[in-house]
Interface confidence: low
């Protein structure tokens, strides 16, 4: 996976004159029709209930820092994470719940019971997805909580836990 | 979140004189790449199968009427819609099921069983999504049928049941 | 369902001259802002672990061939399956899985654990799915492993098991 | 810590119907499983099945025909029936607490079928 | 009703040896295998439960690994009292299901 520089803003863009000139292909490849995405996987090592990301996967026009996606350009973004769990069931039933936060507030969340006959199976094996479509300004963080981190399964499945976003539509 | 003002249609697009004249970063905003999206919560009170919606959401070149979503410009779309149900088990099992209409026709459908185990628990919770890729023409509208409308948990949730559509391709 | 034919490459586009002239929406019509879209349907009949496809679903820009989609346009793609499962459970529990493969390598998988009690129930219903957001290249191919596709429901849910990728942003 | 105790006769008679009782101390039975294994003089291991709390059973095919197991909460038991024993039923008897796999064994019950 | 398969059935060996022993199931089983310890006239201890994970108070000397099919318990020193008949148990399917048993005796 490669993480991609963001390329120049549209306040760049040589509309008229300047490299561009009048070379109508230059100019579309370089009109501001933004596009910014993120695909990070679950760090290995998961000790609270935020959860935290691997930033060397794909981001382009969006920053990672401390388990925050942070929005760089302004626009209606849509955002999905997906969550591998593999309980060891108790005696009891579990509740997995995944929530979505827009600068720590929780907009969106998912929740699905485990173990819900009360037997004990050796393992059982559950995938959550959670999809958001917001508008997000620059500077806004995207982040996951996760009550039950400790059944997000890292190791068996270290590629199956994301968090997605991608710009839709830019507010210009 | 808000509503968002239909923009002018692609025909009223001045590409040659009129306000844009020669301003290329005019005309490239303006240009027929057109963008439509809808982001509806459901309604807090569900009395039938069809479900209802908050039209106070994200609406984007997109009507809300009656339960439906009504399109407004041809192209290709993106249709999701996600619910979180919350089940006071009997002593059988229940089969939950969302059901995406396309012009009052059942175009795709997801089930999942819960409460297998047939024991009374105090609750299992349970989330669904459906996703639909297709060509829509004008007036097409969207619709979501769920049997056990019941279970959907407007109180706890009210933020978790969503049906989102949005343009991809357009007609041109 | 329609398919479509692909559009000419953006190397095609008269950007001066030609037929487009000095008609800028002909222009912007015909620029390199590629969309490559594809939406197929599992096939009726399956008999081994890699699923095949009703090729006469929505192809655009990109191929199918021997249960794999294959890529037209190099960039960014947004890929998601989505099954409907009907399970028979046995006396033991049964872990569905769904493995998505680009150029036959396992990238991401959903497992879900049904019939977890243990106790024979005539059926239970499982959806699953899954998504992934990757850089494919040309000729770069797309499947799906199932492990137990004889649970994959074709007869009652024929249009409910599909296989969807589309271009966000093309390397140009 | 946890510990069990098989008890019942240990001959009887063929045709007749073994009966054992496993009292479980240290610890709650509520919200685990609870098993039989037995092991005929010389050879392997054989799980006969076992009971939840709430009464749920599961029992080896090979035996179904001829075993119930029942449980008693209030007094910290649960216990085998076997009927029509014949011979080849003449094994030591474990309980064992069947968690993530069988954590905790009693001691074990020698029973013999002879007339 | 799974088969498990357990060899050897029985295996000479020195105090300070490494020994492994190895269970085949006829089926897939995922990690729902334990392995227990068992002494003349005693019962079975648990050694290692869902494949590899080392139960409460077992010495680390003893290790499981598998692969769904293919399980191995290893002991990596022997010492004077590992000697005894070990067995694997299946618990995924119905019903439960025990290997024939591997004696370990002193060479």
């Known amino acids: 996976q490669r993480t991609d520089s963001i390329p120049n803003s549209p306040d760049n863009i040589p509309l008229r004159g300047g490299n561009c000139s009048e070379d109508l292909l230059c100019i579309l490849k370089r009109a501001p029709f933004k596009k910014s995405w993120a695909y990070l996987q679950v760090a290995k090592h998961l000790n609270k209930t935020k959860l935290s990301w691997n930033k060397d996967g794909i981001l382009h026009g969006v920053r990672y820092q401390d388990g925050n996606l942070v929005i760089q350009f302004p626009g209606l973004y849509f955002i999905i994470c997906q969550l591998q769990f593999l309980v060891q069931c108790p005696n009891n039933s579990v509740d997995l719940k995944l929530e979505l936060l827009i600068n720590k507030h929780i907009k969106k969340q998912a929740l699905v019971t485990v173990c819900e006959s009360g037997m004990q199976t050796k393992h059982v094996y559950q995938n959550l997805s959670q999809f958001l479509l917001d508008y997000l300004q620059v500077n806004t963080t995207v982040s996951v909580n996760v009550d039950t981190f400790q059944y997000i399964d890292t190791s068996t499945f270290p590629l199956e836990n994301v968090l997605s976003v991608f710009l839709y539509s830019n507010s210009d | 979140q808000r509503t968002d003002s239909i923009p002018n249609s692609p025909d009223n697009i001045p590409l040659r004189g009129g306000n844009c004249s020669e301003d290329l970063l005019c005309i490239l905003k303006r240009a027929p790449f057109k963008k439509s999206w809808a982001y509806l919560q459901v309604a807090k009170h569900l009395n039938k199968t069809k479900l209802s919606w908050n039209k106070d959401g994200i609406l984007h070149g997109v009507r809300y009427q009656d339960g439906n979503l009504v399109i407004q410009f041809p192209g290709l779309y993106f249709i999701i819609c996600q619910l979180q149900f919350l089940v006071q088990c009997p002593n059988n099992s229940v089969d939950l099921k969302l059901e995406l209409l396309i012009n009052k026709h059942i175009k795709k459908q997801a089930l999942v069983t819960v409460c297998e185990s047939g024991m009374q628990t105090k609750h299992v919770y349970q989330n669904l999504s459906q996703f639909l890729l297709d060509y829509l023409q004008v007036n097409t509208t969207v619709s979501v049928n769920v049997d056990t409308f019941q279970y959907i948990d407007t109180s706890t949730f009210p933020l978790e049941n969503v049906l989102s559509v949005f343009l991809y391709s357009n007609s041109d | 369902q329609r398919t479509d034919s692909i559009p000419n490459s953006p190397d095609n586009i008269p950007l001066r001259g030609g037929n487009c002239s000095e008609d800028l929406l002909c222009i912007l019509k015909r620029a390199p802002f590629k969309k490559s879209w594809a939406y197929l349907q599992v096939a009726k009949h399956l008999n081994k672990t890699k699923l095949s496809w009703n090729k006469d679903g929505i192809l655009h820009g990109v191929r199918y061939q021997d249960g794999n989609l294959v890529i037209q346009f190099p960039g960014l793609y947004f890929i998601i399956c989505q099954l409907q499962f009907l399970v028979q459970c046995p006396n033991n529990s049964v872990d569905l899985k769904l493995e998505l493969l680009i150029n036959k390598h396992i990238k991401k998988q959903a497992l879900v654990t049904v019939c977890e009690s243990g106790m024979q129930t005539k059926h239970v219903y499982q959806n699953l799915s899954q998504f992934l957001l990757d850089y494919l290249q040309v000729n770069t191919t797309v499947s799906v492993n199932v492990d137990t596709f004889q649970y994959i429901d074709t007869s009652t849910f024929p249009l409910e098991n599909v296989l969807s990728v589309f271009l966000y942003s093309n390397s140009d | 810590q946890v510990q069990l105790q098989e008890s019942g006769p240990g001959l009887v008679k063929p045709s007749e119907t073994l009966s054992l009782t496993c009292t479980v101390s240290g610890g709650s039975i509520s919200g685990y499983y609870w098993s039989w294994i037995r092991q005929p003089p010389g050879k392997g291991l054989e799980w006969i099945g076992y009971i939840f709390y709430s009464g749920y059973t599961k029992y080896n095919p090979s035996l179904k025909s001829r075993v119930t197991i029942s449980v008693d909460t209030s007094k910290n038991q649960f216990s085998l029936k076997l009927s029509s024993v014949t011979a080849a039923d003449t094994a030591v008897y474990y309980c064992?607490?069947?968690?993530?796999?069988?954590?905790?064994w009693g001691q074990g019950t020698l029973v013999t079928v002879s007339s | 009703a799974i088969q498990m398969t357990q060899s050897p059935s029985s295996l000479s060996a020195s105090v300070g040896d490494r020994v492994t022993i190895t269970c085949r199931a006829s089926?897939?089983?995922?990690?729902?295998l334990g392995w227990y310890q068992q002494k003349p006239g005693k019962a079975p201890k648990l050694l290692i439960y869902a494949e590899s994970s080392l139960q409460s108070g077992v010495p680390s000397r003893f290790s499981g690994s598998g692969s769904g099919t293919d399980f191995t318990l290893t002991i990596s020193s022997l010492q004077p009292e590992d000697f005894a008949t070990y067995y694997c148990l299946q618990d995924f399917n119905y019903p439960y299901t025990f290997g024939q048993g591997t004696k370990l005796e002193i060479k």
């Open positions: 089926q897939g089983i995922r990690n729902n």
């Open positions: 064992a607490r069947d968690r993530w796999d069988f954590d905790y």
